[in-house]
């Protein structure tokens, strides 16, 4: 669902974020502390353009625990 060149929009984007971020939750716009000024928000980046798993993970609310 998030291969190169594919777009994720609407409910598919919401569901994918919920899966990727799991219990961490997610933002549709990155918190200002983690965003550069040109950050567009995930709808812009994944629906209007295409995105990958790494980009999706940047919208999760807290970093994944490293084992």
């Amino acid at each position: 669902a998030y291969g190169p060149g594919e777009t994720l929009c609407g409910g598919e984007l919401v569901d994918t974020l919920q899966f990727v971020c799991s219990d961490r939750g997610f933002y549709f716009s990155r918190p200002s502390s983690r965003a550069n000024r040109r950050s567009r928000g995930i709808v812009e980046e994944c629906c209007f353009r295409s995105c990958d798993l790494a980009l999706l993970e940047t919208y999760c609310a807290t970093p994944a625990k490293s084992e």
Epitope: C9, L13, V14, V43, E44
Partner: antibody, heavy 120, light 107 residues
């Protein structure tokens, strides 16, 4: 109150272009995406695309790629939809509609519609 | 592209009737299904979003249910102002697509 007011009816010849406007009021214009949907006479609803009024980014239905351009003017809280190379089957009522959230929960406020007639 | 199919169309009913309209998606769309009412010469009006959530200001006689591929819109007791055309719309992926509409007519 929240409302979207569209420009008036247009009559165009095949091959021409039309530009429809949609002026928003009663809410923060840049906080909601805006869709364009059309409806041919006696037919159903067809999604054309969406614009983010904040940055101006767009996403168009593949069917309209290359013929449609959606723009916005934040100073007047207005979005525009221009359709080029018009054909007779572009005759329709064109609506702007506000996105609820994330393209996932529908369109909650609609303009009154703009009738575009394409005829030679 | 996700295809949306509505039935029946048209639908004949009387005031006070319980009316059910169905909508089927060509693939699973989870609960990302919205319902609209449209009267002649007017813009559509959002009734139900996310399959079962009632839009603000919409009478409680309208309800929605379903998930995956099969959805229903129910009007518990049809009122004179409910005679209109109803459309379902999937918001799972783009292009956003609508059903063909169900016209609710007076029997």
């Amino acid at each position: 109150q929240v409302q979207l007011v569209q420009s008036g009816a247009e009559v165009k010849k095949p091959g021409a272009s039309v530009k429809v406007s949609c002026k928003a009021s009663g809410y923060t214009f840049t906080s909601y995406y805006m869709h364009w949907v059309r409806q041919a006479p006696g037919q159903g609803l067809e999604w054309m695309g969406i614009i983010n009024p904040s940055g101006g980014s767009t996403s168009y239905a593949q069917k309209f790629q290359g013929r449609v351009t959606m723009t916005r003017d934040t100073s007047t809280s207005t979005v525009y939809m221009e359709l080029s190379r018009l054909r007779s089957d572009d005759t329709a009522v064109y609506y702007c509609a506000r996105d609820v959230q994330w393209l996932a929960y529908g369109m909650d406020v609609w303009g009154q519609g703009t009738t575009v007639t394409v005829s030679s | 592209r996700i295809q949306m199919t509505q039935s029946p169309s048209p639908l004949s009913a009387s005031v006070g009737d319980r009316v059910t309209i169905t909508c089927r998606a060509s693939q699973s769309i989870s609960s990302y299904l919205n319902w609209y009412q449209q009267k002649p010469g007017k813009a559509p009006k959002l009734l139900i979003y996310a399959a079962s959530s009632l839009q603000s200001g919409v009478p409680s006689r309208f309800s929605g249910s379903g998930s995956g591929t099969d959805f229903t819109l129910t009007i518990s007791s049809l009122q004179p102002e409910d005679f209109a055309t109803y459309y379902c719309q999937q918001s799972y992926s783009t292009p956003l697509t609508f059903g063909g509409g169900t016209k609710v007519e007076i029997k």
